[in-house]
Interface confidence: low
Amino acid sequence: SPMYSIITPNILRLESEETMVLEAHDAQGDVPVTVTVHDFPGKKLVLSSEKTVLTPATNHMGNVTFTIPANREFKSEKGRNKFVTVQATFGTQVVEKVVLVSLQSGYLFIQTDKTIYTPGSTVLYRIFTVNHKLLPVGRTVMVNIENPEGIPVKQDSLSSQNQLGVLPLSWDIPELVNMGQWKIRAYYENSPQQVFSTEFEVKEYVLPSFEVIVEPTEKFYYIYNEKGLEVTITARFLYGKKVEGTAFVIFGIQDGEQRISLPESLKRIPIEDGSGEVVLSRKVLLDGVQNPRAEDLVGKSLYVSATVILHSGSDMVQAERSGIPIVTSPYQIHFTKTPKYFKPGMPFDLMVFVTNPDGSPAYRVPVAVQGEDTVQSLTQGDGVAKLSINTHPSQKPLSITVRTKKQELSEAEQATRTMQALPYSTVGNSNNYLHLSVLRTELRPGETLNVNFLLRMDRAHEAKIRYYTYLIMNKGRLLKAGRQVREPGQDLVVLPLSITTDFIPSFRLVAYYTLIGASGQREVVADSVWVDVKDSCVGSLVVKSGQSEDRQPVPGQQMTLKIEGDHGARVVLVAVDKGVFVLNKKNKLTQSKIWDVVEKADIGCTPGSGKDYAGVFSDAGLTFTSSSGQQTAQRAELQCPQPAA
């Protein structure tokens, strides 16, 4: 008999277009489907109603899109999540699922023209109002400006209805004002629980004429390094010329909030041709602490403070580099990007994430599975290396230890970490599995990703699997759904997937097949894989001078800019003196910050796979419900469960 199934995101968002996938497996002829969305638990309101027909021509697969309106049923009540009932009627067969609703309407990105202001000056700021697809939306936004004590000093309710997704705003800072870090907080009126913010500094300052950069040769200090910590001081005028002057440099140890200065480390060094070098010797470091045991310093960090004075004495700039960790290994291994579950008897793809001590990704670090050194790989630019190991067909948990294999490091200096992977549970302990794998490359829009569908199953039933259904989740929505055909005898099938800007910043590919197993019961077999995409602009934008290269802009005169971008796009500009960033580099709105916010709002919760077919769907942010009784557990929380510390 046919199996009817519905798949939706396991969080549906108000006022957002959502997609639902409908399928009829082993069906004959046309199957009419009516989809209705009701309030829960009352079922008093029809929030949306759609109709479609699943036909043999479309392989009995289709989708409907619907939008849940923001009516008063969904007004936020503290501590109470809202749900809807999604119901699909296939002919006369009803399949329904209760789905969690998010009141979050989209994102707000706040940009100030500068990072630091003097009392009495004006803060120019703007708020980008976008939906989950990062397209402009017109909605009411609440804005607060808070002083360093967290007290709101200005509150506004603004509509971005006619602003094409940008609210241009300003605030005059009083002459008498609290110095320190101020905050702009904003949220959509419909979703007050989702607050977006940025900070700016208020301080009396004079713009410097040059910039000082303090850069250690390594991002960490290896505690047994006899050479000590080498640091380069670079000083340049803001227009590019190299500084000649003198630097006074002092080192110190930071332990949480506490700072211990190392007076013996104070040095006066010449800055010639824009740079100078200084070394904190290991002896000075150890002599500077009581009971100097090198091991006691591990886990603490070093800071370097440099004050550069021009030979003329006309200007002086102070700079600091802090948070240089004291370590026993220059690397850390993380399994945050590795699935927690494996399919027995199939490859297990370890996505080993290696970081430098400051948390940044470590590039070109060899890693290997301990005891299986033929399985070795190098980390890429994002710090991730893929290691595939062959697993045993037994249902035992796997304990896997990964080590770095950096030639310059001794065995003691290599980083090592162990993880445990659990076996995926099949329905009725069958031997039916699906493994999705992709090549580890830095994936960019415009490229094609080959997704491998690897099948392992009882040979007697193998011919029954004629297709896989695959679904792509991105930014909390079902971006794409399709079928991958499989011929009898094919263990490996490859799906070429064209990557577009829609796939940024990452996506999850979920696939499954269904069959009547040896026991006569309907079985669903699923897997998923999380894929990172290189963050880049969705549109194109180039800003350049509109004047010929030989005509340098002169103070007090006009200059022209040439802006190239997508037709119909709205462009907003900001001009700022570079000297501002010498004083404060924090809180700039960057592309990577935008993608980080989007990534954090992902409704999927793991790097792939799951404890069973239902876990695969749930962990990827999907619900699965069928007429044969298979279904995912009810998602009750908007946040992903936090792993135990």
Epitope: G371, E372, T374, S388, N390, H392, K405, L454, R456
Partner: antibody
Framework: QVQVVESGGGSVQPGRSLRLSCAVS????????MNWVRQAPGKGLEWIGI???????NYASWAKGRFTISTDNSKNTVYLQMNSLRAEDTASYYC?????????????WGCGTSVTVSS | QLVLTQSPSASASLGASVKLTCTLS???????IDWYQQQPEKCPRYLMQ???????TKGTGVPDRFSGSSSGAERYLTISSLQSEDEADYYC?????????FGGGTKLTVLG
């Protein structure tokens, strides 16, 4: 009954190519990685390379470029393609299954196929 | 570089015991190794997997007379109550960074 049988050996002139086959039974290549190992007359065992489940390969440094391992899962057969053969490639060539995920032992082995390279 | 060193030959009398040694390069002394047997004109056969702490797992059909032990970088294969069919080449092997590595092998002669 788990079995590994090599074939395709013989005499060949230097500079020529030869493809060896390794037919497996009693298990699926879909679940296990396979190794090729050789043994020159009167000498010890020398590892050539491995093909993992899913087709990934790894070779001994000396074998890279001249030797290629591939599989045909539907035929349950592993191949070793040897190009630009030299006299020092004269040896018995063994195929062995890799078992275990932490440290893959080679078990079982075939009984080898003999290759002679001479003019 | 990962190297496994075996003495080229060993001999012992029928019914006696013999202990074959495989030494790992010092940087790799924690590695698990495998022992293989190759009887004259026969195919190689897996005997056991031996860990650094001395525990071992034998292959199917390997007699109880074969056992393994470890000390530091050294891995031992002990054969007690020697029989004529134990006369063979014995190889140790392990997975290294560049792939699988074999020791040079030890030729065991069973006397009289």
């Amino acid at each position: 009954q788990v079995q590994v049988v090599e074939s395709g050996g013989g005499s060949v002139q230097p500079g020529r190519s030869l493809r060896l086959s390794c037919a497996v039974s009693g298990f699926s290549l879909y679940n296990y990685a396979m190794n090729w190992v050789r043994q020159a007359p009167g000498k010890g065992l020398e590892w050539i390379g491995i093909i993992n489940v899913g087709g990934g390969t790894n070779y001994a440094s000396w074998a890279k470029g001249r030797f290629t391992i591939s599989t045909d899962n539907s035929k349950n057969t592993v191949y070793l393609q040897m190009n630009s053969l030299r006299a020092e490639d004269t040896a018995s060539y063994y195929c062995a299954r890799a078992v275990g995920y932490h440290h893959a032992r080679l078990d079982p082995w075939g009984c080898g196929t003999s290759v002679t390279v001479s003019s | 570089q990962l190297v496994l060193t075996q003495s080229p030959s060993a001999s012992a009398s029928l019914g006696a015991s013999v202990k074959l040694t495989c030494t790992l390069s010092s940087a790799h002394k924690t590695y698990t190794i495998d022992w293989y047997q190759q009887q004259p004109e026969k195919c190689p056969r897996y005997l056991m997997q031996l860990k650094s702490e001395g525990s071992y797992t034998k292959g199917t059909g390997v007699p109880d007379r074969f056992s393994g032990s470890s000390s530091g970088a050294e891995r031992y294969l002990t054969i007690s109550s020697l029989q004529s069919e134990d006369e063979a080449d014995y190889y140790c092997g392990t997975e290294g960074v560049g792939g699988y590595v074999f020791g040079g092998g030890t030729k065991l002669t069973v006397l009289g």
